[in-house]
Interface confidence: low
């Protein structure tokens, strides 16, 4: 039984500061009491807490050690946030200019070809920003369509211009073609291969800074156990049931507790490290091909050359064609 | 041979920004975010001694309390009696993390091997398919990286990189940030309660 | 005792570069961030510039960025602040004062200025 | 760079208790107080929103609350006469002062 408080004792000062957490004053006791029924601050003599005070402090400590987390993680969620956002427009920028560039080349180029060629090439590039975004497409599907769609109308108005409007018909068996006779030389490949390459490492990218705010969530919005609970009162409030307002706790102590607290957490450790690490290595291996802002500013070009392939290759093509698909034209021209 | 003018920029604002003078590309942006996030390697494993300098420690106090009594703040009490008959901390450890944390762990384990897939070392093995139906003299040679710009008749390149600082709020403003709702504020009296 | 001296003020013409220097004592100077801050005549305190303790972080007012160098010596326990392209409106006291900070590995948090100089005058004028 | 406003004037008589608010800190870093009298160097009153550094009388208090904070001072002297300054730090690190808050004591 501890021994009686002296007459002048009284819960004064804890009051007026549990008051600030809990306006209403009774839960605590007028002057300092046994405390048996409490389960946390566990007194050595008489004290100034209840069991609601208790529970009021745990459920307040959860709180403190919930609103301390999220301070932490506060400028790194910013910094991913911000970049997850800003590498999202700059690539969308890119493919915007790309398709702009590409639009430019035909318009320059091969007048004759527009205003199919800029559908194409739309289509293409939409394809590509969604491809970016995590859509389930086929980079080799996006190029080849792009060159069975551009083969017709290269055929139709640069090859063979005296041919009355394509038709459906010759317009398959041209298609067909594209592939079968590798029109464009090694060029789709190419593209299929530097496209590919540098927009799976682009969206691998994206995908990674944003599963890197979901790390971020995650453990911003934990919420702590009881026990946890229980070991941040005894750190932070039990003091006070004993009158001692202006005492802190113990540096060594309060380490013991966060990592009692933050075991969980703590075990991301690794795996955060690691994140980082191959995230730094996908960057530096970011260049040339692996680079879309390279490869994607650069296909004007490459799909110049390709149409330039084709002229080169004219004649004999146009003949070859001829063959292949004169039973559609002769179809066409009855 | 492809010819492109600059009136033909569809988009007009890229023309100004070849102005910049401290030119930032989307390389150099990645690589600076790289190197930011490196500073928080340490971020978790930091995180307990991180808490405990933001929340009230005895720093120049001689006492300090252990979580049972006020005890000298260097002396071996100060750590370890707080501890003693009370719940036990390594049962709490032993328990393992949450399941959302476990479920973390297990999309960060995934996207590492993903990245880890994506930087192979990236030899010239990988591209050799490339070579093997052959193009014609001139059409661009074994090495597939040179073709990105292709022809040599005097085509105009475009310069590899856009400027992005005249188009994208790189720096925004930190009230309109992402997150920002996120902030660390007590909320109706109910947190702002570290007495000292 | 824990003390900041200034030094290096003075008057000077538009134009113009002044170097001041911030001597500390009574304290372990590198362990610290520092700042310097200013109050113009008669007006409120600003902040100027800051450098964490190591030297490796360096922070600047928009109204002085590109004018004004901040460093360092912690072998001389010295701070110091170069201006250049001086206005008039950079005239005021300047004061150097040392910051309470925490730093845990990345973690650099900041809570205020403990410890000021006196504070030296710099007057721009022609 | 963020701003953080302050009343420009304060007063009250010996005894009473005045308080002083300071809002636009939206960054998340604590708010701290300082003191300056008349034609002295600034000092520290309190730091970490409601820390005071030794001998500064518990007669001056912090708090905060979101984006604004709040000096108290408690039965106020004519020593307290003063200019008082609230500070945060944005996102970039950059110090930020209040305008700065003039006490008179009647």
């Known amino acids: 039984q501890p021994p009686p408080p002296p007459p002048d004792a009284t819960c004064h000062q804890v009051r007026s500061f549990f008051q600030r957490l809990q306006p209403g004053l009774k839960w605590v006791p007028e002057t300092p009491v046994p405390g048996s029924d409490l389960q946390v601050c566990l007194p050595k003599g008489p004290t100034c807490c209840s069991r609601k005070m208790e529970e009021k402090y745990q459920l307040t400590a959860r709180l403190n050690m919930e609103q301390l987390l999220q301070s932490a993680s506060m400028e790194l969620k910013f910094l991913i946030i911000q970049n997850a956002a800003v590498f999202q427009e700059a690539f969308e920028i890119v493919v915007r200019h790309a398709k702009n560039y590409t639009n430019a080349m035909f318009k320059n180029n091969y007048p004759s070809l527009t205003p199919q060629a800029f559908e194409f090439v739309g289509e293409f590039f939409t394809d590509v920003s969604l491809y970016i975004l995590g859509s389930d497409i086929n980079v080799d599907d996006m190029v080849n369509e792009l060159f069975d769609s551009l083969f017709p109308v290269i055929y139709t108005q640069l090859m063979n211009p005296g041919l009355p409007d394509s038709a459906l018909d010759i317009n398959e068996c041209l298609r067909g073609a594209r592939r079968d006779l590798k029109v464009f030389g090694n060029f789709p490949k190419l593209i299929m291969t530097q496209v590919s390459k540098s927009l799976q490492v682009t969206r691998i990218f994206l995908q990674a800074l944003n599963l890197g705010i979901e790390v971020i969530n995650t453990t911003d919005h934990l919420k702590f156990s009881k026990d946890c609970g229980r070991m941040l009162t005894r750190m932070w409030y039990c003091s006070y049931c004993q009158g001692l307002m202006m005492v802190k706790p113990c540096g060594g102590y309060c380490n013991v507790v966060m990592q009692g607290c933050m075991a969980g957490v703590v075990e991301i450790d690794k795996y955060w490290r690691e994140y980082i690490l191959s995230l730094e290595e996908l960057v530096n291996g970011m260049y040339r091909i692996y680079d879309m802002e390279n490869v994607l500013l650069g296909l004007f070009s490459t799909i110049h050359d390709s149409i330039q392939y084709v002229q080169k290759n004219a004649g004999k093509l146009t003949t070859t064609i001829g063959k292949l698909c004169a039973h559609s034209q002769q179809r066409q021209y009855r | 041979s492809a010819y492109y003018p600059e009136d033909l920029f569809i988009d007009k604002k890229v023309l100004k920004v070849a102005h910049v003078e401290h030119e930032e590309t989307l390389s150099s942006r990645r690589r600076e975010l790289i190197q930011k996030l490196k500073s928080f390697i340490s971020f978790y494993s930091a995180l307990p001694g991180y808490i405990c300098s933001h929340s009230p420690v005895a720093e120049n106090d001689t006492l300090c309390w252990n979580g049972q009594e006020l005890v000298e703040r260097y002396s071996q009490k100060a750590a370890r009696n707080g501890m003693k008959n009370q719940f036990n901390l390594h049962e709490l450890k032993m328990k393992g993390p949450e399941p959302v944390v476990s479920q973390i762990i297990d999309k960060l384990k995934h996207i590492n091997q993903l990245l880890r897939t994506m930087s192979m070392p990236k030899g010239r093995v990988l591209d050799k398919n490339l070579d093997e139906e052959g193009f014609e003299s001139g059409d661009c040679g074994d090495d597939e990286d040179e073709c990105i710009g292709g022809s040599g008749d005097g085509m105009i390149k475009v310069k590899n990189q856009l400027r992005f600082l005249a188009e994208l709020a790189y720096d925004l403003d930190v009230d309109d940030a992402p997150g920002n709702s996120q902030q660390a504020t007590p909320k109706d009296n109910e947190i702002s309660t570290f007495h000292n | 005792e824990v003390q900041l001296v200034e030094s290096g003020g003075g008057l000077v013409q538009p134009g113009g570069s002044l170097r001041l220097s911030c001597a500390a004592s009574g304290f372990t100077f590198g362990e610290y961030a520092m700042s310097w801050v200013r109050q113009a005549p008669g007006k409120g305190l600003e902040w100027v510039s800051g450098m964490s303790g190591s030297g490796d972080g360096t922070y600047y007012a928009d109204s002085v960025k590109g004018r004004f160098t901040i460093s360092r010596d912690n072998s001389k326990n010295t701070l110091y602040l170069q201006m250049n392209s001086l206005r008039a409106e950079d005239t005021a006291v300047y004061y150097c004062?040392?910051?309470?900070?925490?730093?845990?590995?990345?973690?650099?948090?900041?809570?205020?200025?403990?410890?000021w100089g006196q504070g030296t005058t710099v007057t721009v004028s022609s | 760079q963020s701003v953080l406003t302050q009343p420009p004037s304060v007063s009250g008589a010996p005894g009473q208790r005045v308080t002083i608010s300071c809002t636009g800190s939206?960054?998340?870093?604590?708010v701290h107080w300082y003191q300056q009298l008349p034609g002295r160097a600034p000092k520290l009153l309190i730091y970490?929103?409601?820390n005071r550094p030794s001998g500064v009388p518990d007669r001056f208090s912090g708090s905060n609350s979101g984006t604004s904070a709040s000096l108290a001072i408690t039965g106020l002297q004519a020593e307290d006469e003063a200019d008082y300054y609230c500070?945060?730090?944005?996102?970039?690190?950059?110090?930020?002062f209040g305008g700065g808050t003039k006490l008179t004591v009647l």
């Open positions: 970490g929103s409601n």
């Open positions: 004062a040392k910051e309470m900070d925490y730093q845990l590995g990345w973690m650099h948090y900041y809570y205020g200025m403990d410890v």
């Open positions: 939206s960054s998340g870093y604590d």
């Open positions: 500070q945060s730090y944005d996102s970039s690190l950059n110090a930020i």
